[in-house]
């Protein structure tokens, strides 16, 4: 669809005559008829297949025609067509004399023709005007013409329909060839696809308008390139959504079980060396002069009974001093001036001469030690109990009192996390490398299946030993506030009593 535009510029009829040569009276009141049609090798009148248009009387005899387009007038003349412009045409321009105001053909004189011109040729669609001048023996007509596309039509032959829009169906303007040119921020064949915020992750982000970055489920961050870890993940990260990959030193489904108690809590005091020995368990190796589970107790240097052969120990600022009994000498009273003849072995020890009687050695009965069998054996000295267990002397033997979660003679064995049936309401317990996991029956949730869905989490009285239960409304779980002497998430473990020694 387009328009053939014809701009009449000047008509010269100096003698004021008709085509027949007859003079007009009083002058040739001139109007024009234009016929646009398909290309003909020899242009002849006939159906104006592309359109026809007439002007009013524009002047008498010779006159210039002013451009009326700005005022809504009829110059240039418009010959609209609603088909593909073929690129060729024929044009007939007739100048007629109208003695009166009625311009209908039947109202004109029978010889009213002043002049007729016929041209044909090729004409491409474009903004540029083609100037032409046609001269006959009596008249001259100067004019220009062009073909332009109608609004919303584009291309070499005005056949491409393109209507700019900025709505749900597209956001574009039209290029001269009719192709779409997307508005800033839009892309796609019909410019319906917004261009998201620069850097917005292709898979994990999307947008409904330009420069936006909305995250798909499981992703977060300005560019939707950060995964969201599992709900409740404490000390872990993710590489895909809902993962909980534990940080160094943490374990369990939610990475909330401390496997590196030493680093996270530094429990060992006074420069002791800390060794992790399992979930939330550790062993402190004390420096000389300290004792206690956390090496928190300062030892007197005499506490290690350094003086032998019954020597008495005296603390001094820079150490200690042994006062030796008669017959003994040396830093620790380790040298004897006695022999077996002096019966130096106590508690039934047997004396054996050494170095031709210059020295002796006592062979001690069980439960006694020392160079003179003067010391009762303390079987806890070597700290045989692992995982923070307390060593207790029991007559001729010893025993280890283990911390919760450990068992065995030396507390060397982890108790299975599932052994104490931690999953409530018939939940199934699964031992994991770093803890346990409960699979809950229908109607229950929580880490230990302790939460009745949509019911007060404390309704099942999960806390032991008369602990107070609080419901955490944000997570539908409970918290037990333990009375003195009990620990654990349900206050189920008694606190170990301080060790008592028989001497």
């Amino acid at each position: 669809s387009g328009v053939f535009q014809l701009q009449l510029q000047e008509f010269i009829n100096e003698r004021g005559v008709l085509a027949s040569g007859r003079p007009c009276e009083p002058g040739c009141r001139t109007f024009f008829r234009v016929c646009l049609k398909h290309f003909q090798a020899v242009v002849s009148p006939g159906p104006c297949t592309f359109g026809t248009v007439s002007t009013p009387v524009l002047g008498t005899n010779s006159f210039a025609v002013r451009d009326d387009s700005s005022g809504g007038g009829r110059n240039p003349l418009q010959l609209p067509f609603n088909f593909t412009w073929p690129g060729t045409f024929s044009l007939i321009i007739e100048a007629w004399h109208a003695p009166g105001d009625d311009l209908r053909p039947e109202a004109l004189p029978p010889d009213a023709l002043i002049s007729k011109i016929a041209i044909q040729g090729s004409l491409a669609v474009g903004q540029n005007w083609l100037l032409d001048e046609q001269t006959s023996t009596l008249t001259r007509l100067r004019y220009s013409y062009r073909v332009i596309c109608s609004d919303n039509y584009y291309g070499d032959n005005c056949s491409r329909l393109c209507k700019k829009r900025n709505d749900h169906f597209g956001h574009y303007v039209c290029q001269p060839d009719g192709n779409l040119s997307c508005l800033p921020g839009w892309t796609g064949e019909y410019c319906q696809q917004p261009i998201c915020l620069s850097g917005c992750h292709e898979q994990n982000g999307y947008c409904s308008k330009p420069a936006e970055c909305l995250c798909r489920p499981g992703w977060q961050g300005r560019l939707c390139n950060e995964c969201i870890p599992h709900n409740g993940c404490r000390h872990g990260t993710c590489s895909t959504p809902w993962q909980c990959t534990c940080d160094e030193g943490w374990g369990g489904l939610f990475c909330d079980q401390d496997l590196n108690y030493c680093t996270h809590h530094s429990p060992c005091k006074n420069g002791a060396t800390c060794s992790n020995s399992g979930q939330r368990s550790y062993t402190c190796t004390c420096r000389p002069g300290y004792t206690g589970v956390d090496c928190e107790l300062e030892l007197s240097e005499c506490d290690s009974n350094p003086c032998r052969n019954g020597g008495s120990c005296k603390d001094q600022e820079d150490g200690y001093h042994c006062l030796c009994p008669p017959g003994y000498y040396g830093l620790h009273c380790e040298h004897s001036t006695l022999s077996c003849a002096d019966s130096p072995c106590f508690n039934g020890g047997s004396c054996r001469e050494r170095n031709q009687g210059a020295n002796y050695a006592c062979e001690c009965p069980p439960n006694f030690t020392g160079s003179n069998c003067e010391k009762k054996v303390d079987r806890c000295t070597s700290n045989p109990c692992a995982n923070g267990g307390q060593c207790l002397n029991r007559g001729p033997s010893r025993m280890c009192r283990c911390r919760p979660g450990f068992t065995g003679t030396y507390c060397e064995l982890h108790v299975s996390d599932c052994a104490r049936n931690p999953c409530a309401h018939g939940g199934t317990c699964h031992d994991l490398e770093n803890g346990l996991m409960c699979t809950c029956p229908a109607g229950f949730s929580g880490r230990r299946c302790e939460v009745r869905t949509s019911i007060d989490a404390c309704a099942s009285s999960p806390c032991f030993n008369r602990a107070t239960c609080y419901t955490d409304l944000s997570t539908d779980t409970f918290v037990c506030n333990c009375p003195y002497g009990f620990v654990g998430s349900r206050c189920e473990f008694p606190v170990g009593l301080p060790p008592s020694f028989p001497w």
Partner: antibody, heavy 119, light 106 residues
């Protein structure tokens, strides 16, 4: 039906006069130019005279100038041709014709009336 | 005065194309009309404004006009087309007819 009917022809002596009439019907007579065309026996068509729709403009061939007069009465839808000073060479069939506006030519013709001039 | 010249006669076989010419000085600048006249009948307008056909005139009649010559063309000529044909234009004095051409269909 659009129709033109001529009358008034006949035999007349040289130097004599005749008045031809053309009665129009079936179209708006007062809106159209009208003309007379003659055809001598065995010859071609020859234009005689033409008159504008209101009678204000009249043109005639050089061969009849000063002798023949064209006129019209729009109230009677009638065209006239007054023939004076007739000559032998004026012997012909005289046709009344309606002239189409804007170089259309003569689109309606009467059946003709014969004028014979004897010497 | 202005003159239009036609050939006195043209012959054509039935079904063939007949062309009748009309010559005049710068005739292409004017509109030409053509008339058909059969013996004993009034003339009938068959072409006006060079190439236009009045209603009722068969499509086999066509016309053209350029330069100094106008042409009436009858394609697929029939016996009923046998007649005298006249061209007509205008000069400063009034109407001008050509001398006429007798078309014979053999």
């Amino acid at each position: 039906e659009v129709q033109l009917v001529e009358s008034g022809g006949g035999l007349v002596k040289s130097g004599g006069s005749l008045r031809l009439s053309c009665a129009a019907s079936g179209f708006t007579f007062r809106s159209h130019w009208m003309s007379w065309v003659r055809q001598a026996p065995g010859k071609g068509l020859e234009w005689v005279a033409i008159i504008s729709y209101d009678g204000s403009n009249k043109y005639s061939a050089d061969s009849v100038k000063g002798r023949f007069t064209i006129s019209r009465d729009n109230s009677k839808n009638t065209l006239y041709l007054q023939l004076n000073s007739l000559r032998a060479e004026d012997t012909a069939v005289y046709y009344c014709a309606k002239a189409g506006g804007g170089n259309v030519g003569f689109d309606i013709w009467g059946q003709g009336t014969m004028v014979t001039v004897s010497s | 005065s202005y003159e239009l010249t036609q050939p006195p006669s043209v012959s054509v076989s039935p079904g063939q194309t007949a062309s009748i010419t009309c010559s005049g000085d710068n005739l292409g600048s004017q509109y030409v009309s053509w008339y058909q006249q059969k013996p004993g009948q009034s003339p009938v307008l068959v072409i006006y404004q060079d190439a236009q056909r009045p209603s009722g005139i068969p499509e086999r009649f066509s016309g053209s006009n350029s330069g100094n010559t106008a042409t009436l063309t009858i394609s697929g000529t029939q016996a009923m087309d046998e007649a005298d044909y006249y061209c007509q234009a205008w000069d400063r004095s009034g109407v001008v007819f050509g001398g006429g051409t007798k078309l014979t269909v053999l």
